[in-house]
């Protein structure tokens, strides 16, 4: 048993059939000695007298919370929360395994550029009765300052006959040179609570890992004399990191219908235009990444041929 | 204001096209060690990551875009302690911060390029012959080195008596591979840097 | 199977003007760019142009602008090149070859084989 | 118009050996760079496109790197069925040009 956060405990317990389950011993944060009760949630049922609880803690029904009284008034309380391993593992029922971009995968974390901020996610079916706390440093030996903000509500998704909630975080590190090597990895940590389980996840990334940058701004099209061929332009996101003379990004333009069997016209360049074949019905796109280190691509940025 | 992001021509800053080669050697001899050692921990989230150019080297301050001079945490120890020659420098008027930053790339380089050739010779007495260094990418080492000619003392090629550990070598290939690509990574940004300016 | 398949060997006096034909199979005929490409005996590849078999649009590589026309006929998934003035250079196997991509080719014809010759 | 150089023009390998051949642009191209294998009276055939995406039926070691004016196309291990000539194209910009061809000969 540890503490989560004051008059929050967790349990953690091997689950099996006939599993015996952990004793636990609950003291009562008071000065008195004699004449206290024990009642665990809503019910007026005393579960035992005296300072300290004495209670075996085998299945969901054993959690709650335990409150200690004298005379009808309440001295403290202590909630119990059970963390389930199965086989070895630590449960994960709370988080949907997002499967990209490996299996048991829970938190996702991208960053827009180089400042030391980012953002994680992680998905839920479960809408009620459920907190998130985080926390985050670089390093775990000897960590250094990551501040997270709280966890949000940021999407709701109707997948068939669910419901799925996506959660948000954005932390950022307390000192990051965006010119900086890392050796170190960032470390998320999210405990989840739904109802009486408590279930932790983590995640470690370089933030060069998990860059993707916003898509490029202001695309323009300047038709070209005598032929078929259009010029693009377009500049850099503002929240891409400078300057832009070291932080470059590359860029891939793209000419397709709406359809992504369609044919198209593709080209990748390192300035900030290019020039592509129009079609009538069809798009131009671009999108970005960092030059050097290839992290993710920038979602699309388009305007129609026309 | 940010600086002009068209990169004009290569010859115009002889390292930017070097620095260039030297980061997809790295890249393509990083992917084929870890095709080739897949039963190795090769991968970013296996290994330690370890810098052989740690207190003895200091590229990334000493290469600092202007723009991150404001910026404090950029700013934990700026080393001031190379040697200011070189054949990449594109004017006279070439600060002197600019020559510390080239000198401690050439330092890089040259650490880098001793590690890599005493593995290499160990690797090659592996009687399963299993990986090799890219002499590509020892070539292009060594074209930037020139590129960047500095005048400095030639480090002894380690020589090791005893038996080595194949296994250990391999593993130790994947962490210097690692970490050579993230200071590859800055080098091309310092030359694109210096080239736009 | 996408087959492109094109019309036989011919030979032809200088100043005259070939037309080789390039017949697609397997596939959308107006979902693919056609490209026209030539090699001459022992030399390298020489791209001439494309057409979009959807809405005719073409493309010519400048040096065989005003002597190339290439053209497609949808109801045969048929495409067509036209070269006219020719000169004992034009001598040379002349490839069609397709792609969803517009810049590089994924399939190809077997070659068309046109000698200019007096 | 974008010239593409390919060196060597003549490559003789014994069959198990590696095979590089490398092609360079007289510009920057980024990673608009497609290499193709071409054997004596066949179509040209794609191998590798866009520097390093490789084809589905293509055999796993033919390989491509480079960006920017230089290129590379490695073979790790030569078969028999891979003597052929190997050329480079340019998808930068129009008019699309291709390197004169790399013949890999048995040595």
């Known amino acids: 048993i540890w503490e989560l956060k004051k008059d929050v405990y967790v349990v953690e317990l091997d689950w099996y059939p006939d599993a015996p389950g952990e004793m636990v011993v609950l003291t009562c944060d008071t000065p008195e000695e004699d004449g206290i009760t024990w009642t665990l949630d809503q019910s007026s049922e005393v579960l035992g007298s005296g300072k300290t609880l004495t209670i075996q803690v085998k299945e969901f029904g054993d959690a709650g919370q335990y409150t200690c009284h004298k005379g009808g008034e309440v001295l403290s309380h202590s909630l119990l929360l059970l963390h389930k391993k199965e086989d070895g593992i630590w449960s994960t029922d709370i988080l949907k395994d997002q499967k990209e971009p490996k299996n048991k995968t829970f938190l996702r974390c991208e960053a827009k550029n180089y400042s030391g901020r980012f953002t994680c996610w992680w998905l839920t079916t479960i809408s009620t009765d459920l907190t998130f706390s985080v926390k985050s440093s670089r390093g775990s030996s000897d960590p250094q300052g990551v501040t997270c903000g709280a966890a949000t509500l940021s999407a709701e998704r109707v997948r068939g006959d669910n419901k799925e909630y996506e959660y948000s975080v954005e932390c950022q590190e307390d000192s990051a040179c965006p010119a900086a090597e890392e050796s170190l990895p960032i470390e998320v940590m999210v405990d989840a609570v739904h109802k009486l389980k408590y279930e932790n996840y983590t995640s470690s990334f370089f933030i060069r890992d998990i860059i993707k940058p916003d898509p490029p701004k202001n695309l323009q099209l300047k038709p070209l004399k005598n032929s078929r061929q259009v010029e693009v332009s377009w500049e850099y996101p503002d929240t891409w990191s400078t300057p832009h003379s070291y932080f470059s990004l590359t860029f891939c333009v793209q000419v397709q219908g709406k359809s992504k069997r369609e044919k198209k016209d593709r080209v990748f360049t390192d300035k900030t235009s290019a020039t592509v074949i129009c079609r009538k019905n069809a798009s131009i796109s671009v999108r970005a990444q960092d030059r050097y280190y290839s992290s993710s691509w920038s979602e699309w940025a388009s305007v129609p041929c026309s | 204001r940010n600086l002009p992001v068209a990169t004009p021509d290569p010859g115009m800053f002889p390292c930017l096209h070097h620095s260039q080669n030297l980061l997809r050697a790295v890249s393509n001899m990083l992917q084929k060690a870890r095709q080739t050692l897949e039963f190795y921990p090769c991968t970013s989230e296996e290994i330690d990551h370890e810098d052989i150019t740690k207190d003895k080297t200091s590229t990334v301050e000493a290469c600092l875009p202007l723009e991150l001079t404001k910026n404090e945490s950029c700013l934990n120890s700026r080393e001031t302690s190379f040697i200011t020659n070189g054949s990449c420098l594109a004017s006279r008027k070439t600060s002197f911060m600019m020559a510390l930053c080239l000198s401690s790339i050439y330092e890089d380089l040259k650490m880098y390029q001793v590690e890599f050739k005493t593995m290499n010779a160990k690797l090659l007495m592996d009687p399963k012959r299993q990986i090799f260094l890219d002499q590509n990418m020892l070539a292009v080492i060594d074209e930037l080195m020139q590129a960047l000619n500095f005048n400095s003392e030639t480090v002894p090629q380690k020589s090791s008596l005893e038996e080595p550990d194949f296994y250990k070598t391999k593993i130790k290939l994947c962490i210097l591979l690692h970490a050579f690509r993230i200071r590859a990574v800055t080098i091309d940004r310092v030359m694109s840097y210096l080239n736009a300016s | 199977q996408v087959q492109l398949v094109q019309s036989g060997a011919e030979v032809k006096k200088p100043g005259s003007s070939v037309k080789v034909s390039c017949k697609a199979s397997?596939?959308?005929?107006?979902?693919?760019?056609l490209h026209w490409v030539r090699q001459a005996p022992g030399q390298g590849l020489e791209w001439m142009g494309w057409?979009?078999?959807?809405?005719?649009?073409?493309e010519y590589a400048p040096k065989f602008q005003g002597r190339v026309t290439i053209t497609a006929d949808e109801s045969t998934s048929t495409a067509y090149m036209e070269l006219s003035s020719l000169r004992s250079e034009d001598t040379a196997v002349y490839y069609c070859?397709?792609?969803?991509?517009?810049?590089?080719?994924?399939?190809w014809g077997q070659g068309t084989l046109v000698t200019v010759s007096s | 118009d974008i010239v593409m150089t390919q060196s060597p023009l003549s490559l003789p390998v014994t069959p198990g050996e590696p095979a590089s051949i490398s092609c360079r642009a007289s510009?920057?191209?980024?990673?608009?760079l497609h290499w193709y294998q071409q054997k004596p009276g066949q179509a040209p055939r794609l191998l590798i496109y866009?520097?390093?995406q490789s084809i589905s039926g293509v055999p796993s070691r033919f390989s491509g790197s480079g960006s920017g004016t230089d290129f590379t196309l490695t073979i790790s291990s030569l078969q028999p069925e891979d003597f052929a000539t190997y050329a480079c194209q340019q998808s930068n910009s129009f008019p699309l040009t291709f390197g004169q061809g790399t013949k890999v000969e048995i040595k």
């Open positions: 866009f520097a390093s």
């Open positions: 057409i979009d078999p959807e809405n005719g649009d073409t």
């Open positions: 070859a397709r792609n969803k991509e517009l810049r590089y080719f994924d399939v």
């Open positions: 397997g596939g959308t005929f107006s979902d693919y760019y």
């Open positions: 510009q920057s191209i980024s990673i608009n």
